[in-house]
Each structure stands twice: as C-alpha cells, then as structure tokens.
C-alpha cells in the first residue's frame, strides 16, 4: 500500500497476523515523523514484493520483531 | 458474523447532495481501511473510494474527486459517504466494502443502498 | 491508467469448462494481485479467486485462476460447469493498491 504520491502514512489497513519470516524479503519500521504521526511496520514479501501493514501494537507482532531481531542478531558476527 | 450495513440511498435531484452511512461490526473496523465501490443498474462494478484505517489517508476515483469525500468514525464503527453535486451518471447501488489489501485477505460486502438521481 | 478488460458474455454447457480471460492494458497484470468475484443477479459480489490463484474456503476445485505474462492476461477457469454458476464474473487488481481496478464484467451463462 505504500504509494508513491505524498500522503500522511503508508498503511491502509493494519494486520494483528504476524507473516512467515521465512516469506519474508525485509521488514522496515518507520518511527514516527512530521508526515505520519505513528510507528508504521512494514514487511515486504519476496512474492512479488508485496508490502503488508502489520499493527505495531500486536502482541503477535511484537514477538515477530523480537525473533526476526534475534535471527539478525546471530547472523552479524 | 461479519457485516456491513448501509443506508442513507434514495432518490435526488441533479445538482443536489445525499450521505451514506455504513455501520461495520463482527472485525475489527478501526484495523481496517474500508471502500465504496458502486455499480449502476445493468452495468459493471466501479470502485469510488477508499478510507485508510485512521482516517488518514483518503483516495477517489475520478470520476467522483472533488465532489465526494469519504469518512468514517471509528468510536462508531460507522463509515460515510458525503456526495456532493449529484449527477444523473451517479445513480447506481452503492457497497460498503472491506475488500483484500496488504493487511487482509479476506473481503466482506455489505448488501448496497441504490441512489437515484433524478429530476 | 491500469485497464482491465473482459469478454462481454461467455456461455457453455452443463459439465463442460470454460475460461474467461481478463486483459491488462497500460501496466502489467503480473505487477499485482489479480482477484475474482462472482456476482449473482440481486446480490452482492463474493470472492471465487484471490492472488492470482487462491480460492477462498468454501469456494469448489472446479474454480481456478492463472496468469500469462505473455499476453498480460488472467484467467478465471470454471470446470465440470454447474447451472448455479450462472452469474456475472469481475476480475480486479490495483492502480496501485489502493486504488481498485475492476474489470467490465462477464456474463456467464449455462446453457
């Protein structure tokens, strides 16, 4: 949903659904700022490079962030 | 259950304005942009607009920019659609629709109130 | 603007099968999703395919969806035909999400 026009935020609906990390190509948190007044989290799937909104105040959420922060974690030396 | 309910169609004369209402209940409304999508009578679907879950962003077809705006309150659960300057091309059942997007897979239509505009 | 065009009527027996193809113009039609709705007289569109290929629950084996880069086309296909499949049939995608692109609409009817 992310668009190349200028408006306020990307997201057009937000999921409390966590995705599959293993669908996953990257997933971007952007803070809040002077053009979205929120946390917006959005992962980009490797299937056709597909963005979906996640809810940052999603339990299942917060602990897709925490895992996908670990993995990084051991991947860097 | 899932339902969209809409109300407020009716007919009106050229020139003239009418509201929309859809009352959303059975998910969650306030995760979820919500859209008009409008087909005339005998013809195809033609989708109007959409509402971002906040209400933050607001998109039209353009046929109908600049005289209608989409709005909703979530404290209600309730969705609108204020439409200004009516034309006859206007008539047709107007949905209220939770359709696939990038946070939702599935889609919930509501049954459609028809608007007639006609002298 | 993304343009999605449809055959304006299609008709096939009972147990037979039938495609109906749904072509972009001004973009291309694998950049994103592509959806079916199956609409019957009186009633409300319901979703019979979604990206591309995924039917819904409920929605039967005999519906599938495909799409061919090479023509820039989708295409919904209806196989082992039924009577209650007789409805109009849209194809939809983006311009770009979330800005819905439906196609014309095609009439099925089983003869």
């Known amino acids: 949903v992310p668009l190349s026009r200028t408006v306020r935020c990307t997201c057009i609906s937000i999921s409390n659904q966590p995705v599959n990390p293993r669908s996953l190509e990257k997933l971007e948190i952007i803070p809040a700022s002077q053009f979205c007044p929120r946390v917006e989290i959005i992962a980009t799937m490797k299937k056709k490079g597909e963005k979906r909104c996640l809810n940052p105040e999603s339990k299942a959420i917060k602990n897709l962030l925490k895992a996908v922060s670990k993995e990084r974690s051991k991947r860097s030396p | 259950q899932v339902q969209l309910v809409e109300s407020g169609g009716g007919v009106v004369q050229p020139g003239r304005s009418l509201r929309l209402s859809c009352a959303a209940s059975?998910?969650?409304?306030?995760?979820?942009?919500i859209h008009w999508v409008r087909q005339a009578p005998g013809k195809g679907l033609e989708w109007v607009a959409v509402i971002s879950y906040d209400g933050s962003n607001k998109f039209y077809a353009d046929s109908v920019k600049g005289r209608f705006t989409i709005s909703r309150d979530n404290s209600k659960n309730t969705l609108y659609l204020q439409m200004n300057s009516l034309r006859a091309e206007d008539t047709a059942v107007y949905y209220c629709?939770?359709?696939?997007?990038?946070?939702?897979?599935?889609?919930?239509w509501g049954q459609g109130t028809l608007v007639t505009v006609s002298s | 603007n993304f343009m999605l065009t449809q055959p304006h009527s299609v008709s096939e027996s009972p147990g037979k099968t039938v495609t109906i193809s749904c072509t972009g113009s001004?973009?291309?039609?694998?950049?994103?999703?592509v959806q079916w709705y199956q609409q019957r007289p009186g009633s409300s569109p319901t979703t019979v395919i979604y990206?591309?290929?995924?039917?819904p629950s409920g929605v039967p084996d005999r519906f599938s969806g495909s799409i061919d880069s090479s023509s820039n086309s989708a295409s919904l296909t209806i196989s082992g035909l039924k009577t209650e499949d007789e409805a109009d049939y849209y194809c939809?995608?983006?311009?770009?999400?979330?800005?819905?692109?439906f196609g014309g609409g095609t009439k099925l009817t089983v003869l």
């Open positions: 990206e591309d290929n995924q039917r």
């Open positions: 939809q995608s983006y311009d770009p999400l979330p800005v819905w692109v």
């Open positions: 059975g998910f969650t409304f306030s995760n979820s942009g």
């Open positions: 629709a939770k359709l696939r997007d990038n946070a939702e897979y599935t889609d919930y």
């Open positions: 001004g973009g291309s039609i694998d950049r994103n999703y």
